[in-house]
């Protein structure tokens, strides 16, 4: 059997011949050693017994989408049946005091591969034997501690495969310079050691995407905005736009990135090299936000222009390598290509509470029977829309340990002047956070307040 017979043939194997090879990967036309690595179809009854105590699940993730030319990293994590885990030696053991359907196990090991490898014979002095090989016959690399690596992962994409020895979690990075744009499929088959052979335990596949567009995401933040994810913001307060470029392999680290903004409110284009920008909308309504990101990224060099035809034959210029016209074909050459990314959003601008201020605090005189608590009136003004709710959070003087939170609907006239009355149990210094809210906004003000003892002579005062 060949690799493409075993690993699924999502694409014709001729695909690889039409594409440059992925660095370090091999053609899936190669032969697969079925004696060492048996192949089971989906639904084969042997899968049920491929792992002691249940099925192993493989989870494949990637940091897709990847900008063409950058590296994409795939990670596979094995999830073992309940109560099982991999120990420091790579053996699979039962977790202490963990009860599964079979109850507590007397044997601490699910698989004691250390014991197996010590018992195994037929190895030469290098620790190499005919069974410490991958499905294509290549020997295992002898990294320090390789004996503790008991899983074999075979990655397959674009008519090519990559083999890796590992523990319960592995990562593989692939450069996408030679990968066709668009969605691609990565398949992974996982084997475990089984004496001098291997047993399949899991198969998993995942779609990844290679794109020539810079993957761009914009976060938007505005003070007093109640819900930053609904793309509704407040008039007359700056919105901070922060551009996040998805570049996990740092492909664009040395690129100059330009950001071109159109806020959709007839304020024109704004060009910047900073990934954050502030903008204030001064009218209510719906606006179309557009961002274009431009980066000069490493890319393929253009083919050289054809040499001018000489009018009469000229003597040879010597080997092709000496010909300056051939330089652009040198693969290590540092050519740049402009890559672009786009982001578009429709944002709604509404009235909101712009500001809240405590302008006065008054100690409300109370009858004698309640000397241990104080009633304080906070006179509050606000600007912007009419609040519907007031919340007070009373905490310790550091404003960190909340003692009491009270929220209630509030009736405010168009002048936006209101009085909030709150109870303070005992004297001392308190931090008071007061928020006024409506459907779209939440405005906060804070103050430190010093509540005196119940001696009528001691006045209420704002601390500091």
């Amino acid at each position: 059997k060949r690799f493409h017979d075993v690993l699924g043939n999502e694409r014709p194997s001729a695909y690889m011949r039409e594409h440059n090879q992925l660095n370090g990967w091999s053609s899936d036309e190669n032969d697969w050693n079925e004696k060492l690595y048996p192949v089971w179809k989906r639904g084969d009854m042997r899968w049920k017994n491929s792992w002691k105590g249940g099925r192993v699940q493989a989870v494949l993730t990637s940091d897709s989408p990847a900008l063409v030319g950058s590296n994409i990293t795939f990670a596979v994590n094995l999830i073992f049946p309940r109560c099982q885990k991999e120990d420091a030696n790579g053996n699979i053991v039962y977790e202490k005091n963990c009860r599964n359907e079979a109850g507590l196990s007397a044997d601490p090991y699910v698989y004691n591969w250390t014991a197996w490898s010590e018992d195994s014979d037929g190895e030469n002095g290098t620790g190499q034997s005919h069974h410490n090989v991958f499905p294509d016959g290549k020997p295992f690399p002898h990294h320090p501690g390789w004996r503790r690596w008991n899983f074999i992962y075979v990655f397959h994409t674009l008519g090519q495969y990559f083999q890796k020895l590992g523990r319960c979690s592995v990562r593989v990075s692939v450069n996408t310079a030679n990968v066709t744009l668009g969605p691609q499929l990565m398949e992974v088959t996982v084997y475990r050691r089984h004496g001098r052979a291997y047993v399949p335990i899991a198969q998993v596949k995942d779609v990844y995407v290679v794109t020539d567009q810079i993957p761009v995401f914009v976060t938007m933040f505005q003070k007093n905005d109640r819900n930053s994810s609904d793309e509704t913001f407040l008039k007359d307060l700056p919105i901070m736009f922060d551009v996040l470029i998805h570049d996990p392999s740092h492909f664009l680290n040395y690129s100059t990135i330009n950001y071109k903004w159109s806020f959709g409110d007839n304020t024109g284009l704004f060009v910047s090299t900073n990934h954050t920008v502030n903008h204030t909308y001064v009218l209510n309504g719906t606006f179309s936000l557009n961002l274009t990101v431009k980066a000069a990224a490493p890319g393929p060099c253009p083919p050289p222009p054809p040499p001018p035809r000489p009018s009469k034959p000229t003597p040879s210029l010597g080997p092709a390598g000496d010909n300056p016209l051939e330089l652009s074909r040198i693969p290590d050459e540092n050519c740049q290509i402009n890559r672009y990314g786009h982001f578009q959003a429709t944002i709604t601008i509404v009235e909101g509470i712009l500001e809240v201020n405590i302008i006065q605090m008054t100690d409300v005189l109370m009858p004698v029977p309640w000397p241990e608590s104080s009633l304080i009136d906070f006179v509050v003004t606000c600007q912007g829309s009419i609040p519907t709710e007031v919340c007070t959070i009373i905490s310790d003087p550091t404003c960190e340990i909340t003692q009491n939170t009270v929220c209630s609907p509030v009736d405010v006239d168009e002048m936006c002047l209101l009085t909030v009355r709150r109870t303070f149990n005992g004297s001392g210094t308190y931090c008071v956070n007061l928020t006024l809210g409506d459907d779209t906004s939440l405005a906060l003000t804070s103050t430190l307040i010093s509540v005196p003892d119940r001696d009528p002579a001691s006045p209420l005062r704002m601390a500091n």
């Epitope: 009419i386 209630s408 009355r421 109870t423 409506d438 459907d439």
Partner: antibody
Framework: EVQLLESGGGLVQPGGSLRLSCAAS????????MSWVRQAPGKGLEWVSS????????YYADSVKGRFTISRDNSKNTLYLQMNSLRAEDTAVYYC?????????WGQGTLVTVSS | QSVLTQPPSASGTPGQRVTISCSGS????????VSWYQQLPGTAPKLLIY???QRPSGVPDRFSGSKSGTSASLAISGLRSEDEADYYC???????????FGGGTKLTVLG
């Protein structure tokens, strides 16, 4: 002068529906929260629901949550209470009231009778 | 069973001073304004006191409200026969997220 006028009450069978209206005048309706309060025959006052000036915030008593819906049309200066899955214990005079942290003006009420 | 507790009845003779109490908790009376409503027989309720002790215009100064901790009270001085009515206290409850009323106090003016 502030005026609140309820309508839409009447006799309805258990499980039935009714929609109450409250026409407001004499103040800037769109700037004020509004509420519904009810009073069963011979009993005390029970708050039912409140709505913010814009209609974005709504509050309901546990006894009506999921069955009653408060709404408003600021262009018509009208407050509504849609009552579904009515029960015998919903029988009461329903008052429309202005504001929600205190009820400073009340309508005269409309009687809702739920009976088979 | 009301969240706010009022005596079911109170009485007094004309000219007397009568006090009606209303007891609650820190989530309602303790940290929110108390209002008092008067309901004359066969009519809609009317706001008598708001913000614990404030009188709307048109309400005589014979009516006064006060609050102490988690209790509030309504005092009526110089009692008159037209004061015979049901009186309700009310406040927003921040824990229940609901407006709560007392069960009401029926005031009888004797003689």
């Amino acid at each position: 002068e502030v005026q609140l006028l309820e309508s839409g009450g009447g006799l309805v069978q258990p499980g039935g529906s009714l929609r109450l209206s409250c026409a407001a005048s004499g103040f800037t309706f769109a700037a004020r929260p509004m509420s519904w309060v009810r009073q069963a025959p011979g009993k005390g006052l029970e708050w039912v629901s409140s709505i913010s000036h814009s209609g974005g915030s709504k509050y309901y008593a546990d006894s009506v949550k999921g069955r009653f819906t408060i709404s408003r049309d600021n262009s018509k200066n009208t407050l509504y209470l849609q009552m579904n899955s009515l029960r015998a214990e919903d029988t009461a005079v329903y008052y429309c009231a202005r504001k929600w942290s205190t009820f400073d003006y009340w309508g005269q009420g409309t009687l809702v009778t739920v009976s088979s | 069973q009301s969240v706010l507790t009022q005596p079911p009845s109170a009485s007094g003779t004309p000219g007397q001073r009568v006090t009606i109490s209303c007891s609650g908790s820190s989530s309602n009376i303790g940290n929110n304004y108390v209002s008092w409503y008067q309901q004359l027989p066969g009519t809609a309720p009317k706001l008598l006191i708001y913000a614990d002790s404030q009188r709307p215009s048109g309400v005589p100064d014979r009516f006064s409200g006060s609050k102490s901790g988690t209790s509030a009270s309504l005092a009526i001085s110089g009692l008159r026969s037209e004061d015979e009515a049901d009186y309700y206290c009310g406040a927003w409850d921040s824990s229940l997220n609901a407006y709560v009323f007392g069960g009401g106090t029926k005031l009888t003016v004797l003689g």
